[in-house]
């Protein structure tokens, strides 16, 4: 299996909400001896490998933001801790999983990584990750809503309809 990142770059104004998304692709074994562990973290573009380093997102570690289940089951993070930090990670039945960040600030800018670990019981673990950049902008140059750039090409897409501005 692989992990696809539909968008490689998200450009958002301060105060906006955004949902970063990854998608599990390829054959997914739904047998009893396979489970999936999914999580999110911040990282840096390392010289050797992107997403190697695991940094917290708004002080929450990858341990705090994980989802643990079989195959394409739906799941959500433990709400309380994440929601207190304006975060929520979720997974649906179709292999999509995401992290939603509310009320963005300039400090949220950086590289974000989704990680999937396929656990084949009594055999091995297979890890794959996806990376995407979040740029939070302020001032007159900032877009009015989040603009996303697909991974395959640099055609931008406005995602106003899906992500409503945070009201204070």
């Amino acid at each position: 299996f692989k992990v696809a990142t539909p968008y490689s770059l998200y450009v958002c104004p301060e105060g906006q909400n955004v949902t970063l998304t990854c998608r599990l692709l390829g054959p997914v074994d739904k047998g009893h001896d396979v489970t999936f562990y999914k999580t999110w973290y911040r990282s840096s573009r390392g010289e050797v490998q992107t997403c190697s380093e695991r940094r917290p997102i708004r002080n929450l570690t990858f341990q705090d933001l994980h989802l643990h289940h079989g195959g394409h089951q739906a799941a959500n993070t433990s709400h309380d801790l994440a929601q207190r930090h304006g975060l929520e990670s979720a997974s649906d039945h179709h292999g999509n999983f995401s992290i939603t960040m509310r009320n963005l600030t300039l400090l949220d800018s950086g590289l974000y990584c989704c990680l999937v670990v396929e656990i084949r019981h009594h055999h091995s673990e297979h890890r794959v990750h996806g990376a995407m950049e979040l740029q939070v902008q302020t001032g007159k140059d900032a877009p009015s809503n989040c603009v996303v750039y697909p991974s395959s090409s640099q055609e931008s897409e406005n995602i106003t309809a899906h992500h409503h501005h945070h009201h204070h």
């Epitope: 562990y37 050797v48 019981h121 091995s124 673990e125």
Partner: antibody, heavy 118, light 107 residues
């Protein structure tokens, strides 16, 4: 604070049994895989057994398979290791440690000493 | 079972010197390797994860590299508190295995 505390170690005769416990606090125990790792006096570390966050699957080292049983009670934030048919070579400090898929042992207890001797 | 061989068994150095520890795997473990530090009477502490990344709170004098079968842990300038035993551990396959350890002692 975030910690693991082992108990239940002691002196036991060859062929005897012992049950070790590990009490977790300061983190969401039910989120984590848990392992037992041992260290014979003056020797290196040996992974013994691991249990997933939900209690299944379970893994054992060949050296203890059929003799040791790992279990957990998420409601009590506790991990256990039932050790039967103990041998002199099982003498060691036994540590419990937390783990996650694609991760490592990032929190360890202080250990409990098991001595198997006649 | 993947066997991890650490060398040297003992490293005798003075504070301020550079320490280089090696860990070799009997087959590839990709980058799924960690380093731990253990002081007498204490539990091990995670230093490095995924071959080259410092765990939370680990000083910058600790660095590591490698992938596949050959890995290195480097302590750029030894502090008195760094004299301890260091273990590598792989999680590429079951069972989880550790190296036999390298003792870094004061010369």
């Amino acid at each position: 604070q975030v910690q693991l505390v082992e108990s239940g170690g002691g002196l036991v005769k060859p062929g005897g049994s012992l049950r070790l416990s590990c009490a977790a606090s300061g983190f969401t125990f039910s989120d984590y895989y848990m392992s037992w790792i041992r260290q014979a006096p003056g020797k290196g570390l040996e992974w013994v057994s691991e249990i997933s966050n939900s209690g299944s699957p379970i893994y054992y080292a060949d050296s203890v398979k059929g003799r040791f049983t790992i279990s957990r009670d998420n409601a009590k934030n506790s991990l256990y290791l039932q050790m039967n048919s103990l041998r002199a070579e099982d003498t060691a400090v036994y540590y419990c440690a937390r783990d996650l898929p694609g991760w490592y042992f990032d929190l360890w207890g202080r250990g409990t000493l098991v001595t198997v001797s006649s | 079972e993947i066997v991890l061989t650490q060398s040297p068994a003992t490293l005798s150095l003075s504070p301020g010197e550079r320490a280089t520890l090696s860990c070799r795997a009997s087959q590839s473990v990709s980058s799924y390797l960690a380093w731990y530090q253990q002081k007498p009477g204490q539990a091990p502490r995670l230093l490095i994860y995924d071959a080259s990344n410092r765990a939370t709170g680990i000083p910058a004098r600790f660095s590591a590299s490698g992938s596949g079968t050959d890995f290195t842990l480097t302590i750029s300038s030894l502090e008195p508190e760094d004299f301890a035993v260091y273990y590598c551990q792989q999680r590429n396959n079951w069972p989880r295995t550790f190296g036999q350890g390298t003792k870094v002692e004061i010369k």
